[in-house]
Interface confidence: low
């Protein structure tokens, strides 16, 4: 009896695992084996596919074959008993295009009101993703074990912390990887569950803010209790994404070690240009809080988004305001190399009623003023870039009296 070729061959590639599955054409024929050949682009000869020769089942693994994952290959299969079937050719494919991202490895650490998630690719030193290893982003689904209500968190990196959770509560989550550059979404990891710890005696510091004064950064935060000491640490935001190197460590800011106030001041030159993460921890000598939420801190924006400097020319019914570059210490103007918009607030000195003008221009007219009246003006700058949505603090208020009537020209 002639053997029929196997049909419906499926190629499944997950990370560096290459699996072939197919259907038997004739279930009634026993003791049939199956063999595959492969052919690379531009080659005429077929080569035996190692790992997929004389297979008795309908599945085989050819992961051991060292392929160029970006090169198209073609497969063919036949059935064998005493004789052989004709070859059945599988549509050619490129392994990288066909590959799926496998489930990532997930490791959880619990705090009282937070969970730290460490994520790494499921296949270490993967050949498939060798050129894309740093481009993995992850998304996760998290839920309280007791309720099952899911929350999705997109676009996270290899270390992520989820805050504002309840103490002594079991949370479950699953994570999948994505390579946005290649439009690939991976499969979910197994579900991992962890119980948050008993509520810590000391809460973490809150509302951390960075501002610039002279050539120093001023870091401020809020804390519930008095007589505490605080420490501040920093980390490059890039390292947060890619903790491959063992220099991935939070580092102390020495000027902010064991400070007794809810602020610390340190020189701007501590940080080279870049984006950093900052966190603060409180201690009362016996107990230590968990770390605060991490805040992102961009030196370019933080350092240079100073309040605008302006001059006022007073007329009888208006002010002309001329906005200049802010000054650093030493009276050097700061060069702003990104577009700003200006918010100008003005009010009559004897009243609290404020009016606001938003302008892109650096010369602004404030109209409809009363003659011989004192008005006060303050201004601040905003970046126009949505991603870096930052505002300077307001400048100090400047108060001027309008001129007598009929001097508007």
């Amino acid at each position: 009896k002639n053997l029929k070729s196997p049909q419906k061959v499926e190629v499944d590639i997950i990370d560096d695992n290459f699996i072939l599955r197919w259907n038997r054409s004739d279930e009634s024929v026993g003791n049939v084996t199956f063999s595959f050949d492969y052919q690379k682009t531009g080659m005429d000869n077929w080569i035996k596919l190692s790992g997929c020769q004389n297979i008795t089942s309908t599945k085989c693994n050819f992961s051991s074959l060292k392929l160029n994952v970006y090169e198209e290959i073609k497969l063919r299969i036949r059935a064998e008993k005493e004789n052989t079937s004709s070859w059945y050719e599988v549509d050619s494919f490129t392994p990288f295009r066909k590959a799926q991202i496998g489930p990532p490895e997930v490791h959880l650490e619990a705090e009282d009101k937070a969970i730290v998630i460490h994520i790494s690719p499921g296949t270490k030193d993967s050949v498939m993703w060798a050129l894309d290893g740093l481009s993995f982003t992850y998304s996760l689904v998290i839920w309280k074990n007791s309720s099952g209500v899911e929350e999705r968190i997109e676009n996270i990196y290899s270390r992520h912390k989820i805050y504002k959770l309840s103490p002594e509560t079991t949370y479950c989550l699953k994570v999948k990887a994505a390579l946005l550059t290649s439009w690939k979404i991976g499969v979910y990891s197994p579900v991992h569950c962890i119980k948050t710890t008993v509520e810590n005696e000391l809460p973490p510091p809150e509302n951390i803010e960075v501002s610039v004064q002279n050539q120093n950064y001023v870091l401020k935060w809020d804390y519930t209790y008095a007589n505490m000491t605080f420490q501040v640490q920093w980390l490059h935001a890039f390292l947060k994404r890619n903790p491959g190197n063992h220099l991935y460590k939070w580092k102390q800011i020495p000027d902010c070690e064991n400070v007794k106030t809810t602020q610390c001041v340190f020189p701007q030159n501590v940080f080279q240009k870049g984006i950093y993460l900052l966190r603060v921890q409180a201690s009362d000598g016996n107990n230590t809080s968990f770390w605060s939420e991490e805040i992102k801190f961009d030196t370019e924006i933080q350092a240079f988004l100073l309040p605008p400097v302006f001059n006022i020319r007073s007329l009888s019914d208006s002010f002309h305001i001329y906005i200049g570059a802010p000054k650093q210490s030493g009276n050097t103007p700061v060069i702003q190399d990104y577009p700003l918009i200006y918010e100008i607030i003005f009010w009559e000195n004897t009243s609290n009623a404020e009016r606001k003008i938003i302008e892109k221009k650096t010369d602004v007219t404030v109209p409809n003023l009363k003659p011989l009246t004192v008005y006060c003006v303050k201004a601040r700058a905003h970046t126009m870039d949505e991603k870096l949505n930052k505002s300077s603090v307001f400048s100090d208020a400047v108060c001027e009296k309008t001129k007598p009537g009929n001097t508007s020209k």
């Epitope: 490059h236 890039f238 390292l239 890619n242 491959g244 190197n245 063992h246 220099l247 460590k249 580092k251 102390q252 800011i253 020495p254 501590v270 080279q272 240009k273 870049g274």
Partner: antibody, heavy 124, light 112 residues
Framework: QVTLKESGPGILQPSQTLSLTCTFS??????????VGWIRQPSGKGLEWLAN???????YYNPSLKNRLTISKDTSNNQAFLKITNVDTADTATYFC????????????????WGQGASVTVSS | DVVLTQTPGSLSVTLGDQASISCRSS???????????LEWYLQKSGQSPQLLIY???NRFSGVPDRFIGSGSGTDFTLKISRVEPEDLGVYYC?????????FGAGTKLELK
């Protein structure tokens, strides 16, 4: 003043386990950002970084020797240890321990103080 | 692993001469924090190495200013402006940007 001193068996036979101790003073492995590294130098040859351990017990091993190395510490006695299993004549070298502070604020050096070295010979 | 290639392998000088040692890396040594973890050590005969230069060009405390480190990316140089007797020994470059940390093979500085 920071000092480090290595001690070891001096001589051992192939397939045995080499145990080295680094006793240091002038700093503590309890301090944030502090680490100790082990480096070796075969006679008349170059230097090879083997492993290091951080204040928070994080460890790093050179992948080429990872399966044979174990680094540990005893902070209360200011000591760090390195074990190398299944030694061979190729492991004959002077073994140094060195202070390895976390590169960070202001002083971005990786190694700032070395021990005098402990000579180890593997011979049958 | 990152390979650091030092040239020359040995250098014969007269006291008071300038000496120059090159260290070339197989990959850029600028780390993602924009810092370059490239250091120079001197190992005198029978002694352990001592740190001279860190971060390409920063002199470690107590190191005389005749030692000058320079370079970026993959090419680095150590210059000794006027060689003195205590400068003789083997010089190693060392990188800690990539795992594993690696050393150059060394350059022996000796008298003519």
């Amino acid at each position: 003043q920071v000092t480090l001193k290595e001690s070891g068996p001096g001589i051992l036979q192939p397939s045995q386990t080499l145990s080295l101790t680094c006793t240091f003073s002038g700093f503590s492995l309890n301090t944030y950002g502090m680490g100790v590294g082990w480096i070796r130098q075969p006679s008349g040859k170059g230097l090879e970084w083997l492993a290091n351990i951080w204040w928070d017990d994080d460890k790093y091993y050179n992948p080429s020797l990872k399966n044979r190395l174990t680094i540990s510490k005893d902070t209360s006695n200011n000591q760090a240890f390195l074990k190398i299993t299944n030694v061979d004549t190729a492991d004959t070298a002077t073994y140094f321990c060195a202070r390895h502070p976390l590169p960070g604020y202001k002083d971005n050096y990786v190694v700032d103080a070395w021990g005098q070295g402990a000579s180890v010979t593997v011979s049958s | 692993d990152v390979v650091l290639t030092q040239t020359p392998g040995s250098l014969s000088v007269t006291l008071g001469d300038q000496a120059s040692i090159s260290c070339r890396s197989s990959q850029s040594l600028e780390y993602s924090d924009q810092y370059t973890y490239l250091e120079w050590y001197l190992q005198k005969s029978g002694q352990s190495p001592q740190l001279l230069i860190y971060g390409v060009s920063n002199r470690f405390s107590g190191v005389p200013d005749r030692f000058i480190g320079s370079g970026s990316g993959t090419d680095f140089t150590l210059k000794i402006s006027r060689v003195e007797p205590e400068d003789l020994g083997v010089y190693y470059c060392f990188q800690a940007t990539h795992d594993p940390y690696t050393f150059g093979a060394g350059t022996k500085l000796e008298l003519k």
